[in-house]
Amino acid sequence: MAVTACQGLGFVVSLIGIAGIIAATCMDQWSTQDLYNNPVTAVFNYQGLWRSCVRESSGFTECRGYFTLLGLPAMLQAVRALMIVGIVLGAIGLLVSIFALKCIRIGSMEDSAKANMTLTSGIMFIVSGLCAIAGVSVFANMLVTNFWMSTANMYTGMGGMVQTVQTRYTFGAALFVGWVAGGLTLIGGVMMCIACRGLAPEETNYKAVSYHASGHSVAYKPGGFKASTGFGSNTKNKKIYDGGARTEDEVQSYPSKHDYV
């Protein structure tokens, strides 16, 4: 029950996180005009990953897309790439995790297969969250660098009395959305990985029953049945010819691969 709850909660948290990553990527307010210590302008500038916008105090807003690829800063391209990779991994992770949910029955899919899918989706969510956090952090670092550079030459003199005001940009709402969403996706991924450990069925080891035949002493020990997962060979039923039954202490316990997660 706890495993199902952990898996379900992990899925929901990751779903919210990925929705947030998508929202952050699409938002225009990655950087916004810094209003502190600046002359009050009747124009407010803000920029996203895909376009820059200007909102006038009249209420008129105009946005212009970045219609060039080669002309954009490498850092911006890197942030775009990280966010897209995060979204793609997250979307695949969501798809995999839907089929992995313990509460959803799909044919005769065994728990071990669900455990593997849960682990896979968990890892995908973790990487997705890390991509989003990295992307947002790179952009934030870029903003901080540019902010202090523009503060150093806040007013550039132009022929005596005439001055040009340098527009400074600070953190926009999308950065906070991205950080929170990345964190949620990461947490959801960790929860999925934790749930995976509890999903895998442990080996059922039966006590050996000994049959004393004339002339030979043969013991049959049925092994645990486990579906093939691709992560290792199946533990098949093994006939053990050792001239007698094993004691309880001698019964071999086969470690599950999930013990190493």
Epitope: V54, S57, S58, G59, F60, T167
Partner: antibody, heavy 118, light 113 residues
């Protein structure tokens, strides 16, 4: 047709108060930023205050800040300017205007005259 | 506050003549976000409220005759009337629409010669 009609002007003693009103029609008032601009006899135009749409940010000329209050009632399509502690230098024709692209003032009322004199 | 300096203060013009009015601002009115200059030109005829002519320094308001044009960037701007008409007799104002307080120039009075 866009129309802005000011009212509430008149003669008032220094230190007195007056409330100007502007009735708007012919456009979506709630979506528009609106301003008051004044013009003293024979002088240049002087912007007084602006109130934006939506969250209604307000901006004032330094010499009127604290004395004048711009407000709006979107339900009544009306703009107001509450003027307190009036001075002789506030004597002017007060125009109600709508802000347009580029923050330009595209529609103006006919104006209402305010005279501050003892 | 931004100081708007207009010149000349007055001008006598003959019909058909080309007129240029200059406006200088104490700070750049160019917004880096959209590369637009927040300068507006108005025409005010005697006894009337002002009328919007040009916004964003060079965009003509609808219904304004094409003999009116605006140009300039940053701090230096110009209003040009390519062929002055008798009905153009008025006072012309430039306005800073970028910084609060929104400030107007002192105006240029155009008279018929």
């Amino acid at each position: 047709e866009v129309q802005l009609v000011e009212s509430g002007g008149g003669l008032v003693k220094p230190g007195g108060s007056l409330r100007l009103s502007c009735a708007a029609s012919g456009f979506t008032f709630s979506n528009s930023a609106v301003s008051w601009v004044r013009q003293a006899p024979g002088k240049r135009l002087e912007w007084v205050a602006t109130i934006t749409s939506g969250v209604s940010y307000t901006y004032y000329l330094d010499s009127v800040r604290g004395r004048f209050t711009i407000s709006r009632d979107n339900a009544k399509n009306s703009l107001y300017l509450q003027m307190n502690s009036l001075r002789a230098e506030d004597t002017a024709v007060y125009y109600c205007t709508r802000q347009f692209k580029g923050n330009a003032l595209d529609y103006w009322g006919q104006g209402t005259s305010v005279t501050v004199s003892s | 506050d931004i100081v708007m300096t207009q010149s000349p203060s007055s001008l006598s013009v003959s019909p058909g003549e080309r007129v240029t009015i200059s406006c200088k601002s104490s700070q750049s009115l160019l917004n880096s976000g959209n590369q637009k200059n927040y300068l507006t030109w108005y025409q005010q005829k005697p006894g009337q409220p002002p009328k919007l002519l040009i916004y964003w320094a060079s965009t003509r308001e609808s219904g304004v005759p094409d003999r009116f044009s605006g140009s300039g960037s940053g701090t230096d701007f110009t209003l040009t009337i390519s062929s002055f008409q008798a009905e153009d007799v008025a006072v012309y104002y430039c306005q800073n629409d970028y910084f609060y307080p929104l400030t107007f120039g002192a105006g240029t009075k155009l008279e018929l010669k």
